[in-house]
């Protein structure tokens, strides 16, 4: 039960995280015009990974895409790449984890297969989260570096525009969304990896074999000893039916008076 909860929670947390990474990547407020110590302007600039926007006091917002690839700073390209890789890995991880969820039955998929898928998706989420955190951190570092540059016509524009020294940029909302989303995806991935350990079937010290009596059935006597069929006193081991063709959860493996060997 705890394993199912951990896996489910890991999936939900990762889902929220990846949605956040997608939102952050699409947002225009990666950097916003710094208004501190500046004259109060009736025009306000903010920039994203894909376009730069100007908002007027009138409410009019005009956005222009960066219609160049070669003209963009390498760091911006790197941030874009990190965020996209994070999204792609996260999306694949989500797809894999859906099939790995314990509460979803798909054909006769073994627990070991589900465990492997859970681990795979967990690792994908961890890498996805790290990509997002790295991307946002690289951009934040770029902003901090540019903020303190005092060259008269410093290059801070993401779209190849020359900005004057009075236009400085500070952290936008997308950075905080990205950091939180990346963290959530990372946590979700760790939870999936933890859940994987609980899903993996425990190895027993021996092969337990079930025999089917040809002429008669031997029943368990309530409160009495079990017929000698190779089982020891450790009833916590997984019970194997039909020569080990199918394993059941621990809770289901305890014998009752209606079980037959």
């Amino acid at each position: 039960m705890a394993v199912t909860a951990c896996q489910g929670l890991g999936f939900v947390v990762s889902l929220i995280g990846i949605a956040g990474i997608i939102a952050a990547t699409c947002m225009d407020q990666w950097s916003t015009q710094d208004l501190y110590n500046n004259p109060v302007t009736a025009v306000f600039n903010y920039q994203g990974l894909w376009r730069s926007c100007v908002r007027e006091s009138s409410g009019f917002t005009e956005c222009r895409g960066y219609f160049t690839l070669l003209g963009l700073p390498a760091m911006l390209q790197a941030v874009r790449a990190l965020m996209i890789v994070g999204i792609v890995l996260g999306a694949i991880g989500l797809l894999v984890s859906i099939f790995a969820l314990k509460c979803i039955r798909i054909g006769s998929m073994e627990d070991s297969a589900k465990a492997n898928m859970t681990l795979t998706s967990g690792i994908m989420f961890i890498v996805s989260g790290l990509c997002a955190i790295a991307g946002v951190s690289v951009f934040a570092n770029m902003l901090v570096t540019n903020f303190w540059m005092s060259t008269a016509n410093m290059y801070t524009g993401m779209g190849g525009m020359v900005q004057t020294v009075q236009t400085r940029y500070t952290f936008g909302a997308a950075l905080f969304v990205g950091w939180v989303a990346g963290g959530l995806t990372l946590i979700g991935g760790v939870m999936m990896c933890i859940a994987c350990r609980g899903l993996a079937p425990e190895e027993t010290n021996y092969k337990a074999v079930s025999y089917h009596a040809s002429g008669h059935s031997v029943a368990y006597k309530p409160g009495g000893f079990k017929a000698s069929t190779g089982f020891g006193s450790n009833t916590k081991n997984k019970k194997i039916y039909d020569g080990g063709a199918r394993t059941e959860d621990e809770v289901q493996s305890y014998p009752s008076k209606h079980d037959y060997v």
């Epitope: 302007t41 009736a42 730069s52």
Partner: antibody, heavy 118, light 113 residues
């Protein structure tokens, strides 16, 4: 069409208060800010401040804080300019204007003459 | 505050002639974010509210005759009336829309010679 209709002329004594109204029609009132501009007799235009009915934000020019209060009532699409403790130098025509894209004043009220005289 | 200086204070031009009004701002009105100049021109006739002619320094407001044109960038701007008509007699104001407080020029009175 877009219209800004202001209240009629006012004759007030020094120390009194006055409230000038500006009723907007022909557009969604909350979508655009209303600015107030003063024009003293024979003088140029002086920006007083503006209100953003959408965000509730108000900005005043330096000489227009304290005695001057900008407000609005969304239900009747009306902006107000209240001046308290009137002085003789407050005698002027007060205009309201809509702030439109390009930060331009595209529509103006007809103006309200406020005369302060003892 | 941004100081807007208009010149000349008054201008007498013959009908059909070109009228040119200058406006200088104490700081650049060119916004690097969108490469637009936040300057507007208004016309005010006696007893009337101002009327918008030009915004973004050179964009003509709809319904404004094409004899009115705006030019300039940064700190220096010009309003040109290519062929003065009798109905153009008015006071013309420039206004910066970049910094608060928004400020107007002192005005230029255009008359017929």
């Amino acid at each position: 069409q877009i219209q800004l209709v202001q209240s009629g002329s006012e004759l007030k004594k020094p120390g009194a208060s006055v409230k000038v109204s500006c009723k907007a029609s022909g557009y969604t009132f909350t979508n655009y800010g209303i600015n107030w501009v003063r024009q003293a007799p024979g003088q140029g235009l002086e920006w007083m401040g503006w209100i953003n009915p959408n965000t509730g934000e108000t900005t005043y020019a330096e000489g227009f804080t304290g005695r001057f209060v900008l407000s609005w009532d969304t239900s009747v699409s009306t902006a107000y300019l209240q001046i308290s403790s009137l002085k003789a130098e407050d005698t002027a025509v007060y205009f309201c204007a809509r702030l439109y894209y390009g930060n331009r004043f595209d529509s103006w009220g007809q103006g309200t003459l406020v005369t302060v005289s003892s | 505050d941004i100081v807007m200086t208009q010149s000349p204070d008054s201008l007498a031009v013959s009908l059909g002639e070109r009228a040119t009004i200058n406006c200088k701002s104490s700081q650049s009105l060119l916004y690097s974010g969108n490469q637009r100049n936040y300057l507007a021109w208004y016309q005010q006739k006696p007893g009337q509210p101002p009327k918008l002619l030009i915004y973004w320094a050179s964009t003509r407001e709809s319904g404004v005759p094409d004899r009115f044109s705006g030019s300039g960038s940064g700190t220096d701007f010009t309003l040109t009336i290519s062929s003065l008509q009798a109905e153009d007699v008015a006071v013309y104001y420039c206004q910066q829309a970049y910094y608060y407080p928004l400020t107007f020029g002192g005005g230029t009175k255009v008359e017929i010679k």
